[in-house]
């Protein structure tokens, strides 16, 4: 009874629910993540426990500082939901659920080029496709390391397409494309494709 009264005596504003968060919300399988469980009351000694569904994953004490739980997300079921419990003597509160989004990384895309050559211009069509990786995938096309297209979002496993027209160039042009999905800081690039200068009949990508 005393324990119940003690917990009731701790007003909600003195001992509110803890907050569970992670700097990384979108992860790939095998990734290590840190989860932070924190509390607004900085002067209490708090015991933090982390749960995934009903599985207890660890316990840490702290005062004024968040508990940091380091995990590895190896299977789909480990995406969550996670919950943190903050406990002070007989009183405990739970955080809201937190779940990770598991995303498969994009594989290196393949860049294909088609060219229609006229006497004065080259009409270039660039196709870029990453055959693996969670959708949507954003594709960006580059010419000589400079982005020449906006990010093109693809929600299906079809190549992104970008058209450009150039005056017949006198120099070689190098093209590549970038594929990126929701995984932060994880982008892959195609092998570069070099378009030779307009000298003679050399136009290996031209439609005859």
């Amino acid at each position: 009874r005393k324990a119940v009264l003690d917990c009731e005596a701790m007003k909600t504003n003195e001992f509110p629910s803890p907050c569970l968060d992670s700097k990384t919300k979108v992860v790939m399988k095998g990734q290590n993540v840190s989860m932070f469980c924190s509390h607004k009351n900085k002067s209490l000694q708090i015991t933090y426990s982390l749960f995934r569904r009903k599985t207890h994953l660890g316990t840490q004490d702290g005062k004024g500082e968040p508990a940091i739980f380091n995990l590895s997300i190896t299977e789909a079921h480990e995406s969550g939901p996670y919950k943190c419990k903050a406990q002070v003597t007989s009183c405990s509160k739970y955080s809201r659920d937190f779940s990770f989004t598991i995303v498969d990384p994009v594989t290196s895309p393949v860049l294909n080029i088609m060219v229609i050559q006229t006497e004065t211009d080259r009409h270039i069509t660039l196709h870029c496709l990453s055959v693996n990786g969670s959708l949507p995938i954003n594709y960006t096309f580059f010419e000589n390391h400079v982005a020449i297209s906006p990010a093109i979002s693809k929600y299906d496993r079809e190549p992104a397409e970008f058209n450009l027209t150039k005056k017949n160039p006198g120099e070689e042009e190098e093209y590549r494309c970038e594929a990126k999905n929701r995984l932060p800081n994880y982008a892959t690039y195609s092998h570069p494709v070099t378009m030779p200068s307009t000298g003679g009949d050399s136009c290996p990508f031209c439609l005859k």
Epitope: L44, G62, G64, E65
Partner: antibody, heavy 119, light 110 residues
Framework: ESQLVESGGGLVQPGGSLRLSCAVS????????VGWVRQAPGKGLEWIGI???????YYASWAKGRFTISKDNSKNTVYLQMNSLRAEDTAVYYC?????????????WGQGTLVTVSS | DVQMTQSPSSLSASVGDRVTITCQAS??????LDWYQQKPGKAPKLLIY???KLASGVPSRFSGSGSGTDFTLTISSLQPEDFATYYC????????????FGTGTKVTVL
């Protein structure tokens, strides 16, 4: 009345080990954190580490590796295991119950135990 | 580890003087700061805990203030028994932070 009593200090040779005990009475170790602090002769206070009520342990960066804190709730005792001792580890070692705000309680210290590292 | 910068490192004062000691933490320690008094050969004695709470049995001439990183211990009217060394201590601790002591302030007779 709550009190903490340190024991286990004494003379030890460089490279040796020592285990200090902190017997706690009038305090439930499962409700409070207990830390270790030391003071070399003529020097200031130096924080070593702390063990929380559920048993998680945090150390000052200089103490990691050579110093280990543990506790036995059934004996109401906290321990400080010290390995590879050096002359500069000569100090009075104190254990202390940490401050908490519910109920509002200040820290409570033992009287200390002297550790002398010398050949 | 948190670094606690205490100043001054020493001061001379007379009985009846108002004495102020400051402590600055390298990281936010909220209100988790204690002040101790220590006399030679004795264990530290708690004066103030959680930045401003007076410990049991401590005279009201001692007071503490501050939060976050900047803290102050004030002795409103220095008494003969107050000549000692004073330490601040950050008492925040956890996964990413551990406490620490200031370097001390020795208060001597002018």
């Amino acid at each position: 009345e709550s009190q903490l009593v340190e024991s286990g200090g004494g003379l030890v040779q460089p490279g040796g080990s020592l285990r200090l005990s902190c017997a706690v009475s009038g305090i439930d170790l499962s409700s409070y954190a207990v830390g270790w602090v030391r003071q070399a002769p003529g020097k200031g206070l130096e924080w070593i580490g702390i063990i929380g009520r559920s048993g998680s342990i945090y150390y000052a960066s200089w103490a990691k590796g050579r110093f280990t804190i543990s506790k036995d709730n059934s004996k109401n005792t906290v321990y400080l295991q010290m390995n590879s001792l050096r002359a500069e580890d000569t100090a009075v070692y104190y254990c202390a119950r940490d401050v908490d705000s519910r109920p509002p309680t200040g820290s409570l210290w033992g009287q200390g135990t002297l550790v002398t590292v010398s050949s | 580890d948190v670094q606690m910068t205490q100043s001054p490192s020493s001061l001379s004062a007379s009985v009846g003087d108002r004495v102020t000691i400051t402590c600055q933490a390298s990281q936010n320690t909220y209100s988790n700061l204690d002040w101790y008094q220590q006399k030679p050969g004795k264990a530290p004695k708690l004066l103030i805990y959680q930045a401003s709470k007076l410990a049991s049995g401590v005279p009201s001439r001692f007071s503490g203030s501050g939060s976050g990183t900047d803290f102050t211990l004030t002795i409103s009217s220095l008494q003969p028994e107050d000549f000692a060394t004073y330490y601040c201590q950050s008492t925040s601790w956890g996964s990413s932070y551990v406490g620490g002591f200031g370097t001390g302030t020795k208060v001597t007779v002018l």
